[in-house]
Amino acid sequence: FEIALPRESNITVLIKLGTPTLLAKPCYIVISKRHITMLSIKSGERIVFTFSCQSPENHFVIEIQKNIDCMSGPCPFGEVQLQPSTSLLPTLNRTFIWDVKAHKSIGLELQFSIPRLRQIGPGESCPDGVTHSISGRIDATVVRIGTFCSNGTVSRIKMQEGVKMALHLPWFHPRNVSGFSIANRSSIKRLCIIESVFEGEGSATLMSANYPEGFPEDELMTWQFVVPAHLRASVSFLNFNLSNCERKEERVEYYIPGSTTNPEVFKLEDKQPGNMAGNFNLSLQGCDQDAQSPGILRLQFQVLVQHPQNESNKIYVVDLSNERAMSLTIEPRPVKQSRKFVPGCFVCLESRTCSSNLTLTSGSKHKISFLCDDLTRLWMNVEKTISCTDHRYCQRKSYSLQVPSDILHLPVELHDFSWKLLVPKDRLSLVLVPAQKLQQHTHEKPCNTSFSYLVASAIPSQDLYFGSFCPGGSIKQIQVKQNISVTLRTFAPSFQQEASRQGLTVSFIPYFKEEGVFTVTPDTKSKVYLRTPNWDRGLPSLTSVSWNISVPRDQVACLTFFKERSGVVCQTGRAFMIIQEQRTRAEEIFSLDEDVLPKPSFHHHSFWVNISNCSPTSGKQLDLLFSVTLTPRTVDLT
């Protein structure tokens, strides 16, 4: 054999005895008839030698060390060559060592071509015998980053101040390339960064530097995980030990690019996060240790990347093919910003395109699935437009405002289902007839059902909110003059069970001038509370609303207003209220901007309450709350 090392190559070759074996016959390196057991060849030297035995691989090993000095001159970055070529070396177990020294301010990155690396723990070995041992440096101290085999996920390792890479190849291995390159990077301000890339499902076991010995005091080490967006990653700690910290304790921090909750801090004993969608970083931060009894910090953990579990891998069909002018949006519920760790939560179309928001439109059948650890983090909002363009065709036509069962079967809570009801201006009006009579939500008698109907004007320039209504009251129908939106809003998951109580029919009716008319048929059992639209903001200027209140034959209705004066101050016009008996047409008119509101009054027959607003001065709005109570006529009312 002849080994010639070029001058200035900074390569040293050492052939030495390997682990002693029980072989009877010793073996020697022979140089010009001299028998030796160790041979060192330095840069610029050329040596010819042989072995005194047939199988030198059973006796000797060869170490080839190249020192790369990035302190005094430029660094030879790029693909690292095996020098001398393996074909020129004796067939011994060989270890190529690259020792790179650099300034603290320079980051060095080892890039591993496919196959990537897999970290192994103490006592483990690589199936093919090829191992990569990587060390870093903190000042003069060598820190073991880890030992790695082929066929893993580790693609890059970034360090600073220096790196020592040892590639061990068994004598029989045909490999003739290093399989990695070195690049320079800006300072990483930590011990090292290990990048782990997952192409698909799989797992990786990784360890803190120096494992199983102690992680260097007060150091920071980061693992960057590259995970396809449609897969989920979970972290579990297999083994850890905690040191004795002075003040700040060791911790792990999770960082998710694009997340608003970065970084989320965990203690090592905490349950670590699972179901993370897409890329994330994990950092281990050591602490200042007690000088008397420092203890040791070490961590071995596993990252499991898999397709989402349970509910998430079902495919749901949302059939909107027979729907018109409808859109369904699945989106994250608004949550108060916090630094709490939040795993990704996605909805996917055709299991391929995943995003945090998804809008499905009418006219198609959609297949969706979820990538989410907790589906209560999502909700659905649906909008459907029912419009009439030709008043001759629409008049008296009815539509049922029901949530389609396809939507109710999705595993995500329905938040709002809004129907936009559009009519030709000054031609038609609308009437809403509930399957079950409605109660108006008031502070005095709040709705406590799992859903309500929110009724508001759908005319952009008009700020008119009729109110929130839920099943179980006395309102038989609501007539409105023009375009409105009716929103079914759910308040509890129990809506799924109560869905049968929903049901509202809208009909297009001849146009009328009042903004709204409420038909009220009170029950003898309870007090009906009613309030003017736009409560708290005041009835809009020059708006008129009426209540048609039915009084059964054998009953008397008591109409009570909840304040002495309306509080409205008119800038122009007059605000007034008319209470009219329907049978006799007898009416009482009250000037709301001047008069005291009427004392409780008793009505033996059905009656109207009409309230018409002026143009009020700001801050002096018209808000009225009143109640209707039925009592049997036999009671002596005096």
Partner: antibody
């Protein structure tokens, strides 16, 4: 169920020492750390220190380094705290509390009923 | 040491009302904060840990929130049995430190 049973009230003279005990039951005693807390009228609640049997870690607040000594007896599942060179300032209720973790890194999930210490001549 | 400033120091509330107590840390404590309740003559009882996680068996009217340096404990609808002193505790670093306490009294 998890319980921390503390020793009874103590009346001691100034300059003396006292040893308060805290017996854990309903869980594996050596798997969890034990904290000690002082409650006095003047300073509300003060953390004295923590003893982790599992990790062999003992930590003291700077204010109690020369005052308190925490020990454990694994065989009887009991934690002890000895308070030395007592003065009237040490009169207070002392609580032991279990750490939610073995290492002392957690929150206090269970508390003892407290031991009232009165230092008076 | 991390200083925990709790407010208000005392509060009078009627049953059924919503109560919020706040705790401010002198530095970021990474949500490593717990809340506990102490009734007169009794030992403390932990209600919340990790800033917002309810301890098993604690009524759901108690909730915690916050991050960084600012945290709060809310009782959504006060009951008579909720009277007592409420404390916060940071367990982000040694030494552990407590808030000064909030005395909750029923009107």
């Amino acid at each position: 169920q998890v319980q921390l049973q503390q020793s009874g009230p103590e009346l001691v003279s100034p300059g003396e020492s006292v040893k308060i005990s805290c017996k854990g039951s309903g869980y594996t005693f050596t798997d969890y750390a034990v904290h000690w807390v002082k409650q006095s009228h003047s300073k509300s609640l003060e953390w004295i220190g923590v003893k982790s049997v599992y990790y062999g870690i003992t930590k003291y607040s700077q204010n109690f380094k020369d005052k308190a000594t925490m020990t454990v007896d694994k065989s009887s599942s009991t934690a002890y705290m000895e308070l030395a060179r007592l003065t009237s300032e040490d009169s207070a209720i002392y609580y032991c509390a279990r750490d939610s973790y073995g290492s002392s890194r957690g929150y206090f999930d269970y508390w003892g009923q407290g031991t009232t210490l009165t230092v008076s001549s | 040491d991390i200083k925990m400033t709790q407010s208000p120091s005392s509060i009078y509330v009627s049953p059924g009302e919503r109560v919020t107590i706040t705790c401010k840390a002198s530095q970021d404590i990474n949500s490593f904060l717990s809340w506990f309740q102490q009734k007169p003559g009794k030992s403390p009882k932990t209600l919340i840990y990790r800033a917002n996680r309810l301890v098993d068996g604690v009524p759901s009217r108690f909730s915690g929130s916050g991050s960084g340096q600012d945290y709060s404990l809310t009782i959504s609808s006060l009951e008579y049995e909720d009277m007592g002193i409420y404390y916060c505790l940071q367990y982000d670093e040694f030494p552990r430190t407590f808030g000064g306490g909030t005395k909750l009294e029923i009107k």
